[in-house]
């Protein structure tokens, strides 16, 4: 960076090298060049020479003033015009940064994704700070009073093996950067209450020929949790609003859910689950696309329909009486 150059003097920033975005700042340059009484002192920002708001303080020092500085990062350097020197002489350089102190972290959430072996804690960091901001996650056992701290730049994965202080913990997040420090409210957790079941996945769909054709969605999860509640949402891809069906589920076998849908329409399905009565849901599964047949086929036929809409690949095989979709795309 600019800070590694050999200096013939020095450059400094008031109020500081890292300052609040939108502040008025002054950059000072002081020359210390042998056999040179500088005629002029020049400032450069990101390689562009500054024209305005330069004031000479004394024989060796000048000040560059910026009003309402809004750039997150800038490389500054200054030069001197020395008599009898054809080129400007480099004095010194400095990288400067502007940003904001961190907001109070809120919406602190800790979950254990089944089989992950980790407790994942996330939070809303608030507005962008633009400068290096670190987060310390504090985890304190309510049983042993022992506290552990984890340093991170965003979220944190804490091995469940390291949570030796029983089941109940307090979790809070401290945010800090050069401009300030803030601390979240404390979140009380019980390890048994924050487990999210293994992801539910829709594997295929088929539309069955009947007086009123029905579509069956096949879906499954590898969870070992016995009591699981799930939601499946679906809509025509052209619609904005979702329809939601709720299920109490036992994943000892593949789930089959029936839907009575309009013909010749492309639908999207997603599923999510939670341990019954607990707080946290899985994220919605990847979209699964299925197009209902125009009319129910009366004769045996084979066809393949390739559909790459929205990165999803639908392969449909038609045979007498039903249509099957197998969509493993994203």
């Amino acid at each position: 960076g600019i800070t590694n150059i050999n200096c013939s003097g020095h450059i400094w920033v008031e109020p500081a090298t890292i300052f609040k975005m939108g502040m008025n700042i002054s950059i000072y340059c002081q020359a210390a060049i042998k056999n040179c009484q500088p005629r002029k002192l020049h400032f450069y920002k990101n390689g562009i020479k500054e024209r305005f708001q330069i004031t000479r303080i004394n024989k060796t020092t000048a000040r560059l003033w910026y009003k309402n500085f809004l750039e997150p990062h800038a490389s500054m350097y200054c030069t001197a015009e020395c008599p009898k020197h054809f080129q400007e002489t480099l004095i010194c350089g400095k990288d400067i940064s502007s940003g904001y102190p961190p907001d109070i972290p809120d919406e602190v959430t800790c979950v254990i994704y089944e089989y992950s072996g980790n407790m994942t804690c996330t939070w809303n960091a608030g507005k962008l700070t633009y400068i290096d901001t670190k987060y310390v996650v504090h985890v304190k056992s309510l049983e042993t009073e022992e506290e552990q701290q984890y340093l991170t730049s965003s979220y944190i994965n804490i091995s469940t093996d390291s949570l030796q202080g029983g089941k109940k913990y307090l979790v809070w997040v401290q945010a800090a950067n050069a401009l300030g420090m803030e601390e979240s409210k404390q979140l009380q957790i019980h390890l048994d209450d924050i487990v999210i079941p293994s992801a539910a996945v829709i594997s295929r769909a088929e539309t069955i020929n009947a007086t009123v054709p029905k579509t069956i969605i096949y879906w499954d999860s590898q969870t070992t949790i016995e009591k699981v509640s799930c939601e499946m949402r679906y809509k025509a891809t052209t619609n904005q609003t979702w329809n939601v069906k709720e299920f109490d589920t036992n994943f000892t076998y593949v789930q089959q859910s029936e839907f009575y849908l309009e013909p010749n329409i492309k639908y999207v399905f997603q599923v999510r689950c939670q341990e019954t009565g607990k707080r946290y849901w899985q994220p919605w599964s990847s979209p699964f696309f299925h197009k209902t047949p125009e009319t129910v086929p009366q004769v045996t036929s084979k066809a393949f329909q390739h559909d790459t809409w929205n990165s999803g690949l639908t392969v449909a095989s038609i045979s007498t009486g039903h249509l099957t979709s197998d969509n493993r795309g994203d």
């Epitope: 009484q37 005629r39 002029k40 020479k49 004031t55 024989k59 008599p83």
Partner: antibody, heavy 119, light 107 residues
Amino acid sequence: QVQLVESGGGVVQPGRSLRLSCAASGFDFNSYGMSWVRQAPGKGLDLVADISSKSYNYATYYADSVKDRFTISRDNSKNTLYLQMNSLRAEDTAVYYCAVHHSDYFEYWGQGTLVTVSS
Amino acid sequence: DIQMTQSPSSLSASVGDRVTITCRASQDIYTNLAWYQQKPGKAPKLLIYHASSLQDGVPSRFSGSGSGTDYTLTISSLQPEDFATYYCLQDSEYPPTFGQGTKVEIK
């Protein structure tokens, strides 16, 4: 050798517009700052507008008396400097000189073009 | 902006005279001063820059000196072609500013 030739002056009514041009030759136009300096009849020299060189990213400056009325610009491909003068006033009557500077003192000057603002 | 005060505003002199014109800045300008000559109906012409450096092609009878806030243009032996108006210009801080001019007339 350096040559600066202004054009576009003339008599104009108050409130009207005029565009001055300055054709430059004999130097690396991109590397020099260009200015318009005016001289009212029987008066001294005043910097009206300035457009810096490439090293300053062509920063522009205007005297308070012409801010929001005059616009300085340059076409580096044509080695030409312009001054767009809008909402002209009687006090804008002057000889307008195009001048070139490498540092901030004016090294070379054009012959000037007279702008008369009168009803 | 830096203010430049020139004196005298006019002077009468004869051919062969030594003429001195002074320019005072409202603050230290660190020898960032230029002198110009302007004849009626003509553009200004650069004589001196950096307070004491003679521009190419300018006769050696012209010289400049000074530091800090006070600067001087000297014509060692006034010639007929030197009757003109002289301006100083500071370019230490932006924007550059001119003195109000000194008119050198024939006595």
